[in-house]
Interface confidence: medium
């Protein structure tokens, strides 16, 4: 059962796992949310009757029932972690402690002009977990403005004392704010020489690159495979680090992948979601339950209900053997990975999907895509909407894209004429413009920002926001599109489609069905070259066939360019302006998103 | 201490090339990262190019991906950029920069060089 609220004077006595120490009851319950076994907690506010040193301390505590007997005492507070819910989670804390010195190992000291200056500063250091900051009121006049990076082997700090002058926060790498680089790529027969600060199990190099990029101090990983010679350690997941943040040798090594931690773009990857099954694969482990299941999917199934299961392995059933149910084993460890994988046994194994929730929504798994024809699937797009004017008759206007639960992104040009938000009318979840009716349910926009450089599509900033009246609840039909990471920009897109309910041909009418395009990225130099008369900026990025044949047209404006990178899709472009529509060596332009990351999180993010 | 010279700017045609070398000395081994960092007229510093010094790691802006190449010589403590295909868009102050992240933040890095002005122009 989700419980959210917090219990103000209650204590929770024993299931204790560990204690660290936290700024606020509310981020003890995200630490607990993403502990691996935390089910509960209780925290410590400061206060006059209570023991200074055990001020601002998170008991983590687990429980075989989800509940622990509750006492009373004063400046304690209590909860429950999210796991048992269903809503989205994020780490993201944007929070500034005033007062508090968050204590860690002090490894860099610099002036500063301000908090945010300070906090930018950790956001961009590899190893900054959190910082404080001694402002300019701070007695100690050789430290006024000093900006201290911190960080420890948890990620929270060592202790919190009250400090006055001084204010306290966290890096906002997992706010996607960072400017560090992004390195995707695994490296084969490859071994990183550094020193190791963990070690898991883990089934396959992916899994164990998102188990370093979730580690507060793992920054690249090697994974030795089941094939590995010595057997002891095959699938073992070795979390690494260094000084510079980077590996300082490569050694070649055959059955040996390795590969770095992606916390600078964790908001467009799944990070705690392993979905793969794993065949012939044994998963050991605290067993937790044994379940009879018709399926390994119905095993995956029971764990994600179990909150307690981490992981599972399926034992499939002997011919005609227990109505053909199998065994399904639920599973647990101190670190939510297996304690040992096993090979050869007929087993199949898995994680639980309960923690995909506290990855960005945009990471999940859509429906698989029809290959060939043009018209689109219901739920094949989605993050595409239908943005319509009511004024002076209701009509299709533009596309755009959910990005947020109430953020739409689209074209500034769309608004050409638009006078008030009031007029617009947003649908999701659409196919067939023809399902809109008098009373189909729509969100209503609040607000429309439109990127203050915007003067026509053509000179660039052809980007705009709106605000929708309320939150949308995502399905399978309406979900939001990753954002591109800033970090990201080695990765090459092979797979982007264009998708709107534009016109099909230069003197046409707007479509029924919502229509799909595969179109290969053009580099803007080519672009360059067919637009002579205008200025291809960076900001843009075209796409295209040289033949022409297939391209967005009037009425797909403001809709998504969406490419497909490593099972996850992302929103690259952003329908603007070509010449014509699928002309011979006319690419369509389109705003290129990932220039306009800082700008779209500004907006969004504004308290 | 970290010195970083930067030397091969010049005035070159659309379409012609350049090789920018940057002349690293003093305690080198102690960055992790270099890049090349540029500054058009009356524009902020932006990324082009990143090196992870040891491991040889590369990362480019998509303004310049398959048109520049940065390079290093150990050897020679000895960090390149060969730029092809230039643009009008590619003048500007081009700086070398030494640090311990591998990041496209200018506040990264540590140590700068002088900078050396490249202008496309016909």
């Known amino acids: 059962e989700c419980v959210t609220q917090l219990l103000k004077d209650t204590c929770f006595e024993g299931g204790d796992i560990t204690t660290v120490f936290t700024p606020s009851a509310k981020y003890c319950q995200v630490v607990c949310t993403y502990h691996p076994r935390c089910l509960l907690f209780t925290f410590t506010a400061e206060s006059p009757s209570e023991d200074p040193t055990r001020w601002f301390t998170c008991v983590l505590k687990d429980s075989v029932t989800e509940t622990l007997p509750r006492v009373n005492r004063t400046a304690a507070i209590s909860g429950y972690s999210f796991k048992q819910c269903s809503h989205q989670i994020s780490a993201c804390n944007k929070d500034i402690y005033v007062d508090l010195d968050m204590k860690g190992i002090n490894y860099n000291s610099s002036v500063a002009k301000s908090a945010q200056e300070c906090q930018e500063r950790c956001t961009d250091d590899v190893h900054c977990h959190f910082f404080t900051y001694a402002t300019r009121q701070f007695p100690s006049l050789e430290h006024r403005n000093i900006c201290l990076l911190k960080h420890t082997q948890t990620g929270t700090p060592t202790r919190i004392t009250k400090l006055d002058k001084v204010v306290s926060g966290f890096s906002l790498k997992s706010c996607a704010l960072s400017n560090l680089a992004c390195i995707r790529d695994i490296f084969p027969n490859t071994v990183f020489a550094d020193s190791n600060i963990d070690s898991v199990m883990a089934p396959d190099a992916f899994v164990c690159g998102r188990i370093c990029t979730h580690h507060p101090g793992c920054l690249f990983f090697t994974f030795f495979s089941q094939e590995w010679p010595k057997e002891s350690q095959r699938n073992l997941c070795l979390l690494k680090t260094s000084e510079s943040g980077l590996p300082s040798t490569r050694i070649k090594k055959s059955k040996a992948l390795s590969g770095f931690s992606l916390q600078s773009c964790r908001h467009s990857i799944p990070v705690f979601c392993h979905s793969s099954f794993y065949h012939d694969t044994d998963f050991l482990g605290e067993e937790l339950d044994i379940v009879a299941a018709k399926s390994h999917e119905a095993c995956q199934k029971l764990c994600t209900n179990a909150v307690r299961c981490q992981f599972f392995t399926y034992t499939p059933a002997q011919a005609s053997c227990n109505e053909g149910k199998g065994k399904c084993y639920l599973k647990l460890s101190s670190n939510g990975s297996p304690t040992k994988i096993l090979h050869g046994r007929g087993g199949i194994s898995g994680y639980t999907l309960r923690l995909c929730k506290m990855d960005n929504e945009c990471t999940t798994k859509i429906k698989p895509r029809i290959v060939g024809g043009t018209a689109s699937v219901r739920g094949e797009w989605p993050w595409q909407v239908t943005l319509h004017t009511t004024s002076p008759t209701q009509r299709h206007l533009c596309g755009g894209s959910i990005i947020g639960n109430q953020w739409i992104l689209t074209a500034a040009h769309c608004f050409y004429g638009v006078e008030s938000p009031k007029i617009l009318r947003v649908y999701s979840g659409i196919l067939n413009q023809s399902e809109i009716k008098e009373d189909t349910s729509f969100f209503g926009v609040q607000e429309i920002i439109i990127h203050d450089q915007y003067k026509m599509a053509e000179s660039g900033y052809d980007i705009a926001l709106l605000k929708l009246e309320t939150t949308v609840n995502y399905t399978d039909s309406q979900r939001p599109i990753c954002l591109p990471s800033k970090g990201d920009r080695n990765v090459i897109y092979t797979d982007c489609w264009v998708t709107g309910w534009g016109y099909r041909k230069l003197r046409d009418k707007i479509q029924n069905t919502l229509q799909k395009a595969k179109i290969p990225l053009v580099t803007n130099e080519e672009c360059q070259k067919r637009y002579r008369g205008h200025k291809i900026t960076h900001k843009m990025i075209c796409a295209g066939y040289r033949e022409g044949g297939k391209d967005a047209c009037k009425g797909d404006s403001g809709g998504p360019l969406s490419c497909k990178h490593n099972e996850v899709w992302h929103l690259v472009g952003i329908t603007s302006w070509g010449e014509g529509c699928a002309q011979r060596e006319r690419p369509g332009v389109y705003t290129n998103v990932v220039e306009y990351v800082d700008w779209i999180l500004e907006k969004t993010q504004a308290v | 201490q970290v010195q970083l010279v930067e030397s091969g700017g010049g005035l070159v045609q659309p379409g012609g090339s350049l090789r920018l070398s940057c002349a690293a000395s003093?305690?080198?081994?102690?960055?992790?990262?270099m890049a090349w960092f540029r500054q058009a007229p009356g524009k902020g510093l932006e990324g082009v190019s990143l090196i992870a010094t040891s491991s040889g790691f590369i990362s480019y802006t998509d303004s310049v991906k398959g048109r520049f190449t940065i390079s290093q010589d150990n050897s020679k403590n000895t960090l390149y950029l060969q730029m092809n295909s230039l643009k009008p868009e590619d003048t500007a102050v081009y700086y070398c920069?030494?640090?311990?992240?591998?990041?496209?933040?200018?506040?990264?890095?540590?140590?700068w060089g002088q900078g050396t002005l490249v202008t496309v122009s016909s």
């Open positions: 920069a030494a640090g311990t992240q591998f990041s496209w933040s200018p506040g990264s890095y540590n140590y």
């Open positions: 003093g305690y080198t081994y102690s960055m992790g990262a």
